[in-house]
Every structure is written in structure tokens, then in C-alpha cells.
Interface confidence: medium
């Protein structure tokens, strides 16, 4: 739930559940800032706009990241 | 199983302290935001505090702010409760909950674990 | 502050007949952050509905929710003997707050 305070993180909870990156509309990668010390990945899915926030930490969510970031290369000229 | 199970309670007088633990087994605590619940005798339900799975976001009822502080510490797999200069109306079963499983942050899916209480009572 | 008021505060109904509870808000939830909880004496809470109307895992079918704006619903089809209780609806509200209602108790008739 985004909450709205002194520490402006999004993310409560996190998952650790396996997304297909065809599923992916969007994927942010937040860095941390002053607002919150620790970085967020949330995705925004294809279905409904839902958007999930992912564990960093995560082995799922690292081949995830890395899946993504070989596409957006091949894609890149 | 998936198990919460809080400790610490007791009798203490008005004004003082005490610290609720919450050990939590058989999910990856570190990934789940958790809150703390109470209720008082014969009564309903309130909610106390929530914390955010890294301990970053924090929030509290008006009845508690700056009396009560949440924490956690995910290498223990623990929540607590730090209750000061506490007050008769304190007094209550207080309930360890994990925020539901949902993973659509614009969504909110409730608390699907709870624990089976830890009883405080204040009184002089 | 949103305030949850629940109607009737008591409920007293037969097994096998169809109890409906209502929850009203001060003012308009987002049916997302909406929740019912079932409790019976001596025990913690169950989550029952989440999202105004996803029923929680293990919950039966004869347990709905429904509703919008200030006006929410559970509605339990057939009253098993099990299912005498109390029921809460509650609210999530940035700041955080998490609103319970006072709770309804449906009891034996």
C-alpha cells in the first residue's frame, strides 16, 4: 500500500513470486534516496495495471531484472 | 506452519513500561509489512501500530503515538511492541498480525495471520 | 478520520438462515481497502473478506462481500452452526490508519 510519510517508501510488503517478463507493462527501479533509504522495484503488469512491489534480494527477481535488462539491449540499435 | 506468537505481557502500574516480542515462524518474515491489534475487555478491535517489512514505514493510532513504538528485527524474525507510560486503558489482549499476501500495492489485503495474544494488564 | 459504523449491533438468526451485515463509512473507502474478520470467544480474529468482495484463502463460498463508497456488505448464505460469532469490517486509510468497526455478533436464535 502506498503510505504517505516522513519516510516516503511505497512498499510494505514485498514478493518474492517469479513474474513473467511478458506480463511486464512497466518495471521501476527506484534507487535510494533521501525519502527512502533502501531501493524499490515495482512492476506494473500488463492485466488490470496492477502493480507489485518486487524483492531486490530476491533470486526470482534478479534473473527477472537481468531478463529485462538483455532485452532492452537487443532492442537497443 | 505458518505460526505468530507473541510473549511479554503482564501486570504492570500506570506510567510504566513494557516490550511485546512477536516471534514469527514457517514464512519469510523480512518480505511482510506486520501490525499490532488490541482488545480491550468485552470489547472490539483496535488497531495499534503497523511497521513496513524493512522497518522503514511506521505508523500508529492517535491513542498510542508517542507512547508506543514498533520494531523489528528480520534476523530474529521478530516484532515488538515498546509500550510506555502506559495507562489503565492500555489495558487489553494485544494481537500480532501479518499483513496480508497481496503483492498489488494499490490494494489492500488485510491481515491473514494473526497471533493468539499476549494479555496486559495496568493496574495500581 | 473515517468512522465505520455496523448495523445491527446484534443479529439473532437459526442455523440454515441468511444473515446479512452492514458496514457504513463516514465517509467513501476505496472498495481495495476494505476487510471482514470473523471472531469468536477466546480466539484471535480471522480474515474473512479482503477487497470489499476476494474472499481469503480456506474462507467457504458462503461467506460474501460486497458494496462501494460508504456502503459495504457480508452477507453469510446459510448459517452453520460454526458461524456464530462476531464479525468486524475494517478500513485501510493513508496516514496509515486501519479503521475496525465495533463489530456486529451474530448469535443463536
Known amino acids: 500500500i502506498p503510505l504517505s510519510r516522513t519516510v516516503r517508501c511505497t512498499c510494505i510488503s514485498i514478493s518474492n513470486q517469479p513474474v513473467n517478463p511478458r506480463s511486464l507493462e512497466k518495471l521501476e527501479i527506484i534507487p535510494p534516496s533521501q525519502f527512502c533509504p533502501h531501493v524499490e522495484i515495482i512492476a506494473t503488469m500488463k492485466k488490470k495495471g496492477e502493480k507489485r512491489c518486487l524483492n531486490p534480494e530476491s533470486k526470482a527477481i534478479k534473473n527477472l531484472l537481468k531478463a529485462v535488462s538483455k532485452e532492452r539491449s537487443k532492442r537497443s540499435p | 506452519q505458518v505460526q505468530l506468537v507473541e510473549s511479554g505481557g503482564g501486570v504492570v502500574q500506570p506510567g510504566r513500561s513494557l516490550r511485546l516480542s512477536c516471534a514469527a515462524s514457517?514464512?519469510?518474515?523480512?518480505?511482510?509489512?506486520m501490525h499490532w491489534v488490541r482488545q480491550a475487555p468485552g470489547k472490539g478491535l483496535e488497531w495499534v501500530a503497523v511497521?513496513?517489512?524493512?522497518?522503514?514505514?511506521?505508523g500508529y493510532a492517535d491513542s498510542v503515538k508517542g507512547r508506543f513504538t514498533i520494531s523489528r528485527d528480520n534476523s530474529k524474525n521478530t516484532l515488538y511492541l515498546q509500550m510506555n507510560s502506559l495507562r489503565a486503558e492500555d489495558t487489553a489482549v494485544y494481537y500480532c498480525?501479518?499483513?496480508?499476501?497481496?503483492?498489488?500495492?494499490?490494494?489492500?489485503?488485510?491481515?491473514?495471520?494473526w497471533g493468539q495474544g499476549t494479555t496486559v494488564t495496568v493496574s495500581s | 478520520e473515517i468512522v465505520l459504523t455496523q448495523s445491527p449491533g446484534t443479529l439473532s438468526l437459526s442455523p440454515g438462515e441468511r444473515a446479512t451485515l452492514s458496514c457504513r463509512a463516514s465517509q467513501s473507502v476505496s472498495s481495495s481497502y476494505l476487510a471482514w474478520y470473523q471472531q469468536k470467544p477466546g480466539q484471535a480474529p480471522r480474515l474473512l473478506i479482503y477487497g470489499a468482495s476476494s474472499r481469503a484463502t480456506g474462507i467457504p463460498d458462503r461467506f460474501s462481500g460486497s458494496g462501494s463508497g460508504t456502503d459495504f456488505t457480508l452477507t453469510i448464505s446459510r448459517l452453520e452452526p460454526e458461524d456464530f460469532a462476531v464479525y468486524y469490517c475494517?478500513?485501510?486509510?493513508?496516514?496509515?490508519?486501519?479503521?475496525f468497526g465495533p463489530g456486529t455478533k451474530v448469535d443463536i436464535k
Open positions: 475494517q478500513q485501510y486509510g493513508s496516514s496509515p490508519i486501519f479503521t
Open positions: 511497521i513496513g517489512f524493512a522497518g522503514l514505514i511506521k
Open positions: 514457517g514464512f519469510t518474515f523480512s518480505e511482510y509489512g
Open positions: 498480525a501479518r499483513e496480508g499476501a497481496g503483492s498489488n500495492i494499490y490494494y489492500y489485503y488485510g491481515m491473514d495471520v
